[in-house]
Interface confidence: medium
């Protein structure tokens, strides 16, 4: 089977059940339902999934049975619309149920919430978790899928199955270990961090498809796959791009069964054709399906073919440039992007896309000019400033990171971004700036040749988080502008923002800066978040505060927390010393 099946199926639900197997079918339906109805209790979802699974089995037995010919959207949508508390729990989302497919599914998609009002996941004691795991392994793992899926409504479903497999393996191994906690906790931390990163990366793919269209996603995929598979022919890369686009379009559209099935087919195709794709796939292709697909997605770049000719010959010097462009614009631009990307694993994908856009704009202008060749002869010179801008930015920020360390680097970014877009909510500014700050430890350790693809493509993922969170409750025209004008220029757009001079400082509220003894029992990370929240609020109160003023206040704050956490009567200390700290801070900042 190729990724595009042309064989007709009487029953789509039976077809997917047979392709995926019962276990994966149930897991994917649970993920789909939890991503749509994010507030529903676990037990309600399990009941719905069991009903769908039983129905699927009747269709496997007899594809002509009643309703088996219905589309998956119709079947799943009908099932979701049976939820009794839909109106009370989800408000206007209940109106989706009055619509017909495909409008009903589009309506459900529009109501996915990137920041659902759900309690933070608290990790129970290791013994409690191990008991729950042993008592009912199936329910324990389903609960994991449910909790992740409802908090991350765009999580890449087939990849979530891979995470669940690792989650199960961690418990299977560690619940038998002598020191369960020492074995389990680092594994769970790793899964949590990787899961958040995976969710954010997929969110960017979905935003790319949904906000900027298939062409934008395909351009991204051509660039990335050409970097990864520089020995593959252009036609091969194009085929992979088409198939990958289909997979991600399906997952982003809530078609998780089709997506998982097509992703498996794509992995199969890649492994069957690895000789013409990449020499780095051998190990990946020996793994079981979920591991194989994950491995292929993360595989290192293959070596560039030796003696690749100069790009200028075909794309600048050739007399056929305008003719080839006119013949098939997107193919010619695709070839340009492919040829440029395979030669530049040292560039970020977004930079490659900026170069391709510049090239396209130049050809559009020049191929209608009196002397096209003279007009576009210097097009590669226009690339120089585009390449140097991220190089310089990364150099400066890595120097700052090495000087300050991660926490203080995050603080510098918090101040920078709060001054740029002070209207954005404090939790969003803290979350985004903390993640932006992680670029330092993630990428600055790399040699020059790997820094830009690591840093700028990571920043694209993080800034997309800002964009999707801001879209839910838009408060800043500047954020909206940077988020919507151009996908590939988001980072330069935010970088170019200066202090927002139109911002009216927030009224001072002592309550914002009142702390209690509970801060002492927080983890180091949570304590940092408290301090960073205070820092953002300070900047919102006094946007013109200097670095030195802010540093002095933050140092006093750190000393105050340390002092009161050592005090015998912590609560009294926080109350009395807190008042003094607020007064001193107001004086220091001239509030």
């Amino acid at each position: 089977r190729g990724v595009f099946r042309r064989d007709a199926h009487k029953s789509e639900v039976a077809h997917r059940f047979k392709d995926l197997g019962e276990e994966n079918f149930k897991a994917l339906v649970l993920i789909a339902f939890a991503q749509y109805l994010q507030q529903c209790p676990f037990e309600d979802h399990v009941k719905l999934v069991n009903e769908v699974t039983e129905f699927a089995k009747t269709c496997v037995a007899d594809e002509s049975a009643e309703n088996c010919d219905k589309s998956l959207h119709t079947l799943f949508g009908d099932k979701l619309c049976t939820v009794a508390t839909l109106r009370e729990t989800y408000g206007e989302m209940a109106d989706c149920c009055a619509k017909q497919e495909p409008e009903r599914n589009e309506c459900f998609l529009q109501h996915k919430d990137d920041n659902p009002n759900l309690p933070r996941l608290v990790r129970p004691e290791v013994d409690v978790m191990c008991t729950a795991f042993h008592d009912n392994e199936e329910t324990f793992l389903k609960k994991y899928l449910y909790e992740i899926a409802r908090r991350h409504p765009y999580f890449y479903a087939p990849e979530l199955l891979f995470f669940a497999k690792r989650y199960k393996a961690a418990f299977t191994e560690c619940c038998q270990a002598a020191d369960k906690a020492a074995c389990l906790l680092p594994k769970l931390d790793e899964l949590r961090d990787e899961g958040k990163a995976s969710s954010a990366k997929q969110r960017l793919k979905c935003a790319s498809l949904q906000k900027f269209g298939e062409r934008a996603f395909k351009a991204w995929a051509v660039a990335r796959l050409s970097q990864r598979f520089p020995k593959a022919e252009f036609a091969e890369v194009s085929k992979l791009v088409t198939d990958l686009t289909k997979v991600h379009t399906e997952c982003c559209h809530g078609d998780l069964l089709e997506c998982a099935d097509d992703r498996a087919d794509l992995a199969k195709y890649i492994c069957e054709n690895q000789d013409s794709i990449s020499s780095k796939l051998k190990e990946c292709c020996e793994k079981p399906l979920l591991e194989k697909s994950h491995c292929i997605a993360e595989v290192e770049n293959d070596e560039m073919p030796a003696d690749l000719p100069s790009l200028a010959a075909d794309f600048v010097e050739s007399k056929d440039v305008c003719k080839n462009y006119a013949e098939a614009k997107d193919v010619f631009l695709g070839m340009f992007l492919y040829e440029y990307a395979r030669r530049h694993p040292d560039y970020s994908v977004v930079l490659l896309l900026r170069l391709a856009k510049t090239y396209e704009t130049t050809l559009e202008k020049c191929c209608a000019a009196a002397d096209p060749h003279e007009c576009y002869a210097k097009v590669f010179d226009e690339f120089k400033p585009l390449v140097e801008e991220p190089q310089n930015l990364i150099k400066q920020n890595c120097e700052l990171f090495e000087q300050l360390g991660e926490y203080k680097f995050q603080n510098a970014l918090l101040v920078r971004y709060t001054k740029k877009v002070p209207q954005v909510s404090t939790p969003t500014l803290v979350e985004v700036s903390r993640n932006l700050g992680k670029v330092g430890s993630k990428c600055c350790k790399h040699p020059e040749a790997k820094r830009m693809p690591c840093a700028e493509d990571y920043l694209s993922v993080v800034l997309n988080q800002l964009c999707v969170l801001h879209e839910k409750t838009p408060v800043s025209d500047r954020v909206t502008k940077c988020c919507t004008e151009s996908l590939v220029n988001r980072r330069p757009c935010f970088s170019a923002l200066e202090v927002d001079e139109t911002y009216v400082p927030k009224e001072f509220n002592a309550e914002t800066f009142t702390f209690h003894a509970d801060i002492c029992t927080l983890s180091e990370k949570e304590r940092q978040i408290k301090k960073q929240t205070a820092l953002v609020e300070l900047v919102k109160h006094k946007p013109k505060a200097t670095k030195e003023q802010l540093k002095a206040v933050m140092d006093d704050f750190a000393a105050f927390v340390e002092k009161c956490c050592k005090a015998d009567d912590k609560e009294t200390c926080f109350a009395e010393e807190g008042k003094k700290l607020v007064a001193a801070s107001q004086a220091a900042l001239g509030l």
Partner: antibody
């Protein structure tokens, strides 16, 4: 306004030569490919070949290679389709089309030239 | 013999929807959505109604829509009207340095 105007209908005998024309106006003639399409009586459309008037690069469909010649004179914004020796099976309606962006997309068409070859 | 395959004829009643398929699209044409559809009335020049698989030129009714799955493209006409009765042909890019190809054409009859 973009227009493609083709020369009038022709009645010829087998073995004779013929050159029909397609004049473009209202756009930059040298920046777009021109395609020629044959439609035999009661049959479907067939792409015969394409030409880029900017440099006269010409490509033919395999079944028309050596059977016809496509040319262009950019100074008068005109493309041509010619036969050196007509056959009865060349009887058909011939259309020219401006190809926008990709060769499979003819966005403006001539009105057609009917060629009849009969002894 | 065309490289693209279409049904010779389809028919439908006014108000109904019909779909015409076009199989044999090359993978490169598929990757870049290089498929067009033309409408032709007897004795008239073809008219572009869909390009790049799904796009409609301005002035073309939104009753006409295009889609693609794998190596098959489809043209759907909804709310069929008497003046939709015509020949419909698909055309696809045949690869760099090659000439495009047409499908054999499909005669639509409105009953």
């Amino acid at each position: 306004e973009v227009q493609l105007v083709q020369s009038g209908a022709e009645v010829k005998k087998p073995g004779e030569s013929l050159k029909i024309s397609c004049k473009g106006s209202g756009y930059s003639f040298t920046s777009y490919w021109i395609g020629w399409v044959r439609q035999m009586p009661g049959k479907g459309l067939e792409w015969m070949g394409i030409i880029y008037p900017g440099d006269s690069d010409t490509r033919y469909s395999p079944s028309f290679e050596g059977q016809v010649t496509i040319s262009a004179d950019k100074s008068i914004s005109t493309a041509y389709l010619q036969w050196s020796s007509l056959k009865a099976s060349d009887t058909a309606m011939y259309y020219c089309a401006r190809l926008h962006g990709v060769v499979s997309r003819g966005d403006y068409w001539g009105q057609g030239t009917l060629v009849t070859v009969s002894s | 013999q065309s490289a693209l395959t279409q049904p010779a004829s389809v028919s439908g009643s006014p108000g109904q929807s019909i779909t015409i398929s076009c199989s044999g699209i090359s993978s490169l044409a598929g990757s870049y959505n290089l498929v067009s559809w033309y409408q032709q009335y007897p004795g008239k020049a073809p008219k572009l109604i869909i390009y790049e698989v799904t796009k409609r030129p301005s002035g073309v009714s939104n009753r006409f829509s295009g889609s693609k799955s794998g190596n098959t493209a489809s043209l759907t006409i909804s709310g069929l009207q008497a003046d939709d009765e015509a020949e419909y042909s698909c055309s696809s890019y045949a690869g760099r340095n090659a000439v495009a190809v047409f499908g054999g054409g499909t005669q639509l009859t409105v009953l």
